[in-house]
């Protein structure tokens, strides 16, 4: 079941999925000046069986100026630097995503893809939040959100994360509420879809959150 909405927006924070549940779809979008190749896929789809999941279809972009060609232009160094990638840096990868059954790992970038990736999540998907550069978590419970089905409608749980500018918190050096334990979560926010592996991702990620940042933009 597709989630009807996007994950909640937290001021000065971004979110990221560590792995994508089967059924997730990703728009095949190209950066300005490029378009999908003729008869190219509109979406990638995370699909698989009990032992292996992978992305069906492949996104391919070609220059808008050229007709009937699949020539793919390699970005110049400054273009590559500017690109906001959805790949997280290796120190940030909490666990091997392939170890999550029924999930796909982050699709590798395709040439000349758009700077922003638009995912269409399914029920049971978990995303993780962190403060953007220049902001820190003042106090925080679980910094994740799960898409849940309730009374036939989908909704995202509310992440317990507040991001504040570093100047505002300088009077409280090093002060930060400890991460709430799963037992401390309100019943309404507890999801039967959270697996041990999912929680392991969340806790390991929390440990590395303050020192690194991912730059994906989401709508």
């Amino acid at each position: 079941e597709l989630c009807d909405d996007d994950p909640p927006e937290i001021p000065h924070a971004t979110f990221k999925a560590m792995a994508y549940k089967e059924g997730t779809m990703l728009n095949c979008e190209c950066k300005r000046g490029f378009r999908r190749i003729k008869s190219g896929s509109l979406y990638m789809l995370c699909t698989g069986n009990s032992s292996h999941s992978s992305w069906d279809n492949q996104c391919q972009c070609t220059s808008s100026a050229t007709r009937n060609t699949t020539k793919q232009v390699t970005p110049q160094p400054e273009e590559q630097k500017e690109r906001k990638t959805t790949e997280m840096q290796s120190p940030m990868q909490p666990v091997d995503q392939a170890s999550l059954p029924g999930h796909c790992r982050e699709p590798p970038p395709w040439e000349n893809e758009a700077t922003e990736r638009i995912y269409h999540f399914v029920v049971g998907q978990m995303v993780y939040y962190q403060c953007v550069q220049g902001y820190r978590a003042l106090h925080r419970g679980p910094a994740e959100s799960v898409c849940k089905m309730t009374h036939g409608k989908t909704r995202w749980t509310q992440p317990q994360l507040i991001c504040t500018g570093e100047m505002e918190t300088s009077q409280f050096p090093g002060e930060e509420k400890p991460q709430a334990s799963p037992e401390g979560r309100p019943e309404s926010e507890t999801s039967c879809l959270v697996t041990t592996t999912d929680f392991q991702i969340q806790t390991e990620m929390a440990a590395t959150m303050e020192t690194s940042i991912f730059t994906t933009e989401y709508q």
Partner: nanobody
Framework: EVQLVESGGGLVQPGGSLRLSCAAS????????MAWYRQAPGKQRELVAT???????TYADSVKGRFTISRDNAKNTVYLQMNSLRPEDTAVYYC?????WGQGTQVTVSS
């Protein structure tokens, strides 16, 4: 899920025009790449036109210059304006978003 409902099909003479509409619900419309497909009797479903989130259109060669795809994000609707219709345009026209399809609307071009 995404629900898609097409309308606007009908019988038209060669050279005539029709405007198809597809109303979408159930998912943030502005995040969707929208497409129109068509299927003629005994033939495979073929892509007619797509429109990006920013409104950029793409057309099949067979309809380029005659058909125009557009979207209204405020109304959660995508349109297909079909001009200079030909008998070979006769088909059931389907709206598509993600893996979801409308029920189709019949377009018949005949004198």
């Amino acid at each position: 899920e995404v629900q898609l409902v097409e309308s606007g099909g009908g019988l038209v003479q060669p050279g005539g025009s029709l405007r198809l509409s597809c109303a979408a619900s159930g998912r943030s419309f502005s995040t969707l790449i929208m497409a129109w497909y068509r299927q003629a009797p005994g033939k495979q479903r073929e892509l007619v036109a797509t429109i990006e989130r920013d409104g950029t259109p793409t057309y099949a060669d067979s309809v380029k210059g005659r058909f125009t795809i557009s979207r209204d994000n405020a109304k959660n609707t995508v349109y297909l304006q079909m001009n200079s219709l030909r008998p070979e345009d006769t088909a059931v026209y389907y709206c598509n978003a993600l893996r979801f399809w409308g029920q189709g609307t019949q377009v018949t071009v005949s004198s």
